[in-house]
């Protein structure tokens, strides 16, 4: 489900860029961090790829956006939206948000100044 995103800059241009990149490695990387290496999560076999490899693939994908820095918040919001229904309780939601906000730093990007992840209409 795609929702209106973006608080910073040209949101429609960011939305197009976010649409073009594959956010799955980022989603898998975060799920790996919060579920632990030993657990399989949903349809992803998160044990098949080491966490560091997954993180690198995630960073590479984010780098594919023309305006990585400017569109970072929209990318994080989309990852949250994509995974929202898979998060089974509020503690998991909090962990996911925390790991998500750490993602830019892990990829050596600047963290967005303001990025509201509570954008899923009460779903997450």
């Amino acid at each position: 489900m795609r929702r209106e995103r973006g608080r910073q800059g040209d949101s429609s241009s960011c939305e197009r860029q976010v649409d073009r990149v594959n956010l799955k490695p980022c989603e898998q990387h975060i799920m790996q961090r919060i579920m632990g290496e030993q657990e399989q999560y949903d349809s992803y076999d998160i044990r098949s790829t080491r966490s560091s490899d997954q993180q690198q693939r995630c960073c590479d994908e984010l780098n594919e956006m023309e305006n990585t820095q400017r569109c970072m918040c929209e990318a994080l919001q989309q990852i949250m939206e994509n995974q929202c229904d898979r998060l089974q309780d509020r503690q998991m939601v909090q962990q996911f948000k925390r790991e998500l906000m750490n993602l830019p730093q892990q990829c050596n990007f600047r963290a967005p100044q303001r990025c509201d992840l509570d954008v899923s209409g009460g779903r997450c």
């Epitope: 929202c84 229904d85 089974q88 309780d89 509020r90 503690q91 998991m92 939601v93 909090q94 962990q95 899923s120 209409g121 009460g122 779903r123 997450c124």
Partner: antibody, heavy 115, light 107 residues
């Protein structure tokens, strides 16, 4: 399977304090948040708040700020509820309960406040 | 605060009947809703989490549906063992309000 075992019934005088424990087993303690719920005699369930077992950050419902404290001892997989300045209206059964797909309830602890 | 309104407050039905309890949230809660069953003198137990997921070990005659503000718990064929009070509970990050409960009796 998930099991939550609470401490036994308590009788206290008004103004005293009580600490209820909730020992978890059968799952990774830090995986699910722990809720505390109050049920006064003959009444419905009242959500008191929850504590994130990863960060130990408590969240209290509006009516349960001040005299109520949630805490954890992750080394023994136990959550605690402490109530200070007890009043007669605190007489109730207190339950701990986990969130999520493994959602489970403790058996309850009756706290009676009477002079 | 999010308010949860359950209806009816009491329900009387015959063994084998299909029974429906509804729960309405004062604002959208997505699918962050659980249903609990409490039999007299015992602790509640979780039946349904995240609106429609049946907790393992719970009989398949129980089902949950809904999202946003309107939710339903259905017992497809009421059994004597189902006599209890049923509570809905919303559980977002900052709150966890319960409905006032629905007492289910056998006619």
């Amino acid at each position: 399977q998930v099991q939550l075992v609470q401490s036994g019934s308590e009788l206290r005088k008004p103004g005293a304090s009580v600490k209820v424990s909730c020992k978890a087993s059968g799952y990774t303690f830090t995986k699910y948040g722990m809720n505390w719920v109050r049920q006064a005699p003959g009444q419905g369930l009242e959500w008191m708040g929850w504590i994130n077992t990863n960060t130990a950050k408590p969240t209290y419902a509006q009516d349960f700020t001040g005299r109520f404290v949630f805490s954890l001892d992750t080394s023994v997989n136990t959550a605690y509820l402490e109530i200070s300045g007890l009043k007669a209206e605190d007489t109730a059964v207190y339950y701990c309960a986990t969130d999520g797909s493994e959602g489970s309830w403790g058996q309850g602890t009756l706290v009676t406040v009477s002079s | 605060d999010i308010q949860m309104t359950q209806s009816p407050s009491t329900l009387s039905a015959s063994v084998g009947d299909r029974v429906t309890i509804t729960c309405r949230a004062s604002q959208s809660i997505g699918t962050w809703l659980a249903w609990h069953q409490q039999k007299p003198g015992t602790a509640p137990k979780v039946l349904i989490y995240k609106a429609s997921n049946l907790k393992s070990g719970v009989p398949s005659r129980f089902s949950g549906s809904g999202s946003g503000t309107d939710f339903t718990l259905t017992i497809s064929s009421l059994q004597p063992d189902d006599v209890a009070t049923y509570y809905c509970q919303q559980y977002n990050t900052y709150s966890g309000t319960f409905g006032q409960g629905t007492r289910v009796e056998i006619k």
